[in-house]
């Protein structure tokens, strides 16, 4: 038995919006009908909390009101979207999966997905 | 899947020893860092300890008095406790997080990677 297996992209480039999209696809050992997914960023040495939603299968997925994240799922495949990114926030996002319900419990966590984020430069002033 | 059972806290006097044990069923310990963590009341759950195949790494507060340790062929996880202070009273949690080849020394023991919690077992360091 081994954990349970979580893919996402190695490399996203964030658009010049600061807005980065990526597929978070995992292989439920089971059935579950209640699904915790939770975005982790890993940078410095220093693990953060992105966002978390919990949902229930076949139903939309609801992050917090405040929440920088937005997402779909389809099956065992969570669309993610991260926004309002900027370079400092280039780093790798890694996708933690958790099947809450019904039991057993299964955890997965995938490699990471390392964001890219270049500032916009600024508009130069024109004449007219 | 993994079920983590873990045993051996109580009650003991400052200076004094405690070994803690989290037997893993379900699954094989290998493929996963495993960690202690404690919580004292009103506080947050902190980091003790975590190791994996080839690392262990220590939360600076206990560097020196703690000591974890896996033995795969019991599928059993192990902190020893020594000198034990008044303030390491707490609750002591055992978890599993699958083994990452992005992982650290500084972040493999990060409990937002943790999942399979255990109840948690209560050690009381007081005279």
């Known amino acids: 038995c081994k954990a349970m297996h979580v893919a996402q992209p190695a490399v996203v480039l964030a658009s010049s919006r600061g807005i980065a999209s990526f597929v978070c696809e995992y292989a439920s050992p089971g059935k579950a009908t209640e699904v915790r997914v939770t975005v982790l960023r890993q940078a410095d040495s220093q693990v953060t909390e992105v966002c978390a939603a919990t949902y229930m299968m076949g139903n939309e997925l609801t992050f917090l009101d405040d929440s920088i994240c937005t997402g779909t799922s389809s099956g065992n495949q969570v669309n993610l979207t991260i926004q309002g990114l900027r370079a400092m926030d280039t780093g790798l996002y890694i996708c933690k999966v958790e099947l809450m319900y019904p039991p057993p419990y299964y955890l997965g966590i995938g490699n990471g997905t390392q964001i890219y984020v270049i500032d916009p430069e600024p508009c130069p002033d024109s004449d007219f | 899947e993994v079920q983590l059972v873990e045993s051996g806290g109580g009650l003991v006097q400052p200076g004094g020893s405690l070994r803690l044990s989290c037997a893993a069923s379900?699954?094989?310990?290998?493929?996963?860092?495993i960690g202690w963590f404690r919580q004292a009341p009103g506080k947050e759950r902190e980091t003790v300890s975590c190791?994996?195949?080839?690392?262990?790494s220590y939360a600076d507060s206990v560097k020196g008095r703690f000591t974890i340790s896996r033995d795969n062929s019991k599928n059993t996880l192990y902190l020893q406790m020594n000198s034990l202070r008044a303030e390491d009273t707490a609750v002591y949690y055992c978890?599993?997080?699958?083994?990452?080849?992005?992982?650290?020394?500084?972040?493999?023991?990060?409990?937002?990677?943790?999942?399979?919690w255990t109840q948690g077992t209560q050690v009381t360091v007081s005279s």
């Open positions: 978890a599993a997080s699958p083994d990452k080849p992005f992982y650290t020394d500084q972040t493999m023991c990060n409990k937002h990677y943790y999942g399979y």
């Open positions: 379900g699954s094989t310990l290998d493929p996963f860092v």
């Open positions: 190791i994996n195949r080839s690392r262990t």
